[in-house]
Interface confidence: low
């Protein structure tokens, strides 16, 4: 018996071929022996089965000995053994219809769980294997669970349902609501303007919600709210902003914040949260600000950084075109009685310069 797998809502074609390539008498019946369709002269006739309004045949292929049955808008309960009777022979085709649906909204926040449920006919024992857009393979039986969605899970999931060594493929579009980055660090010299950007990893027709940036300055004992804002149909409006620092915010997406000046007292970590309308939970992005200052005071040349830096970062003071260098895995370096010339302060990670500041040391006569 031939087995054909179908998808709920789709169309399936069950083939039946006669040995002689000519138009001949045929019938399609279900397992209860109730006629679904057949041929009467040159006309397609339909029996009283529940498929009568959704079953059809390709009349153009009858004279080639092909007597297929097409079933439209498949339902799980269409799963059955169908019998084609032609030339005094019976051909049986077992149709198994499966449906795969997401249990919840397909727009989910990062960290939320996704459950895909397989609808299957009684008596079947299918297996399901799903592949995420990022190449993650998840397999299961009648349900597949992804406990914690990640941003790379956004996109089209391809799920293969296997039964009786046959397969049927489902495509489900999942949108993971998240920022493009979980965390970002901005490195600035003291006094420079700071730009924070928070691009979203998704697009929605209507995007409404509210957000807030909380900031924990390195020098401060507690965090404080720097800005709160509303989002209405992708338009940003500031609700409240601190006086110090006086942040500015772009009116359009992506969310964009400008800090007029990078100062040591602002160095630290922030957490931007965005609560979307009709969604439980919030989107988060961490942002870090590292500020560098190079100063000369009397006979001491000092370079300092403030903000969250990794212990493996190197801070160096280097005299341009000379070999004189002081390097430390620390947040401050200094040179006593520095030579005259252009000194560079460098913050680097494994040789890659993250931030640099130049300071000119004039000769003292």
């Amino acid at each position: 018996k031939k087995v054909v797998l179908g998808k709920k809502g789709d169309t399936v074609e069950l083939t039946c071929n006669a040995s002689q390539k000519k138009n001949t008498q045929f019938h399609w019946k279900n397992s209860n022996q109730i006629k679904i369709l057949g041929i009467q002269g040159l006309f397609l006739t339909k029996g009283p089965s529940k498929l009568s309004d959704r079953a059809d045949s390709r009349k153009s292929l009858w004279d080639q000995g092909c007597f297929s049955m097409i079933i439209k808008n498949l339902k799980i309960e269409d799963s059955d053994t169908y019998i084609c009777e032609v030339e005094n022979k019976k051909e049986e085709v077992e149709l198994l219809v499966f449906g795969l649906t997401a249990n919840s909204d397909t727009h989910l926040l990062e960290g939320q769980s996704l459950t895909l449920t397989l609808e299957s006919p009684p008596g079947s024992s299918p297996s399901v294997k799903c592949r995420s857009p990022g190449g993650k393979n998840i397999q299961g039986g009648r349900t597949i669970s992804v406990p914690q969605l990640e941003r790379q899970d956004s996109g089209t999931w391809t799920c293969t349902v296997s039964q009786d060594q046959k397969t049927v493929e489902f495509k489900i579009d999942i949108v993971v609501l998240a920022f493009q980055k979980a965390s970002s660090t901005v490195y600035k010299k003291e006094g420079e303007q700071v730009e924070f950007s928070f691009p979203l990893a998704f697009t929605l027709e209507k995007l409404t919600g509210s957000g807030e940036l909380w900031w924990q300055a390195e020098r401060a004992s507690s965090s404080k709210s720097w800005i709160t804002f509303d989002l209405k149909n992708k338009e940003v409006s500031v609700k409240r902003v601190t006086q110090d620092p006086k942040l500015q915010m772009g009116k359009k997406l992506p969310l964009h914040l400008t800090l007029p000046q990078a100062l040591p007292q602002y160095a630290g970590s922030g957490n931007l949260t965005l609560a979307l309308e009709a969604k439980t939970g919030k989107l988060h992005q961490e942002v870090n600000l590292v500020v560098m200052r190079a100063t000369q005071f009397q006979e001491n040349l000092t370079c300092e950084v403030w903000g969250p830096t990794s212990p493996k970062l190197t801070l160096s003071l280097k005299l341009e075109n000379k070999g004189a260098t002081v390097s430390k895995q620390a947040k401050a370096v200094w040179v006593l009685n520095p030579e005259a010339g252009m000194w560079q302060c460098l913050l680097s990670d494994s040789g890659q310069v993250l931030l640099e500041s130049n300071i000119k040391v004039v000769p003292t006569w």
């Epitope: 009684p122 399901v128 009648r142």
Partner: antibody, heavy 120, light 107 residues
Framework: QVQLLESGPGLVKPSETLSLTCTVS????????WSWIRQPAGKGLEWIGR???????NYNPSLKSRVTMSIDTSENQFSLNLSSVTAADTAVYYC??????????????WGQGTTVTVSS | DIQMTQSPSSLSASVGDRVTITCQAS??????LNWYQQKPGKAPKLLIY???TLETGVPSRFSGSGSGTDFTFTISSLQPEDIATYYC?????????FGGGTKVEFK
């Protein structure tokens, strides 16, 4: 972990109906097929049939005319009724969970079994 | 229904012996075959599925092979706790059917 326990009369008269219940504890009755298997003394295993959470059933054709299975999700129980019993139905009756995984279909959890004797 | 024929129906072996049981299906069942162990007075326990995959926690001395209609179950070195009856079971088609069993005992 999931445990199964069969219950029902140990003695049934010929021509009467054998009724057994299997109680599922330590887990949900959802998302699995639940089956009945029997084993006459000193003989092999025979699959009687199975039932799904939706109430859909599959029976062994050799017993189909006499078998009825039901499921009670609120009580976490499923049942077997075998009508018109004869001495040939004397056996140890097991309930089991049929677990489905990719490349796997097997009975991974079994009850301890209950002996049913058909005798007048 | 798919008939499952197991042989031998019983065998005697000593500790450390290699024990082999065969199972033949009446039609091609691909790899859809399980092996169960049943100790006296106990319920069966699944040892091998998909003809050759060892269930979690089952000792590696148990193995299975075969595809289509002919299958083999092997105990590489018989242990005292392996004394039991072993059954093959197909899951290619409903109804699920078992072999007649092979009783393994000591010489």
């Amino acid at each position: 972990q999931v445990q199964l326990l069969e219950s029902g009369p140990g003695l049934v008269k010929p021509s009467e109906t054998l009724s057994l219940t299997c109680t599922v504890s330590g887990g949900s009755i959802s998302s699995y097929y639940w089956s009945w298997i029997r084993q006459p003394a000193g003989k092999g295993l025979e699959w009687i049939g199975r039932i799904y959470i939706s109430g859909s059933t599959n029976y062994n054709p050799s017993l189909k005319s006499r078998v009825t299975m039901s499921i009670d999700t609120s009580e976490n129980q499923f049942s077997l009724n075998l009508s018109s019993v004869t001495a040939a139905d004397t056996a140890v009756y097991y309930c089991a969970r049929e677990l489905e995984r990719p490349y796997y279909y097997g009975m991974d959890v079994w009850g301890q079994g209950t002996t049913v004797t058909v005798s007048s | 229904d798919i008939q499952m024929t197991q042989s031998p129906s019983s065998l005697s072996a000593s500790v450390g012996d290699r024990v082999t049981i065969t199972c033949q299906a009446s039609q091609d069942i691909s790899n859809y075959l399980n092996w169960y162990q049943q100790k006296p007075g106990k319920a069966p326990k699944l040892l091998i599925y998909n003809a050759s995959t060892l269930e979690t926690g089952v000792p590696s001395r148990f193995s299975g092979s075969g595809s289509g209609t002919d299958f083999t179950f092997t105990i590489s070195s018989l242990q005292p706790e392996d004394i039991a009856t072993y059954y093959c079971q197909q899951y290619d088609n409903l109804p699920l059917t078992f072999g007649g069993g092979t009783k393994v005992e000591f010489k």
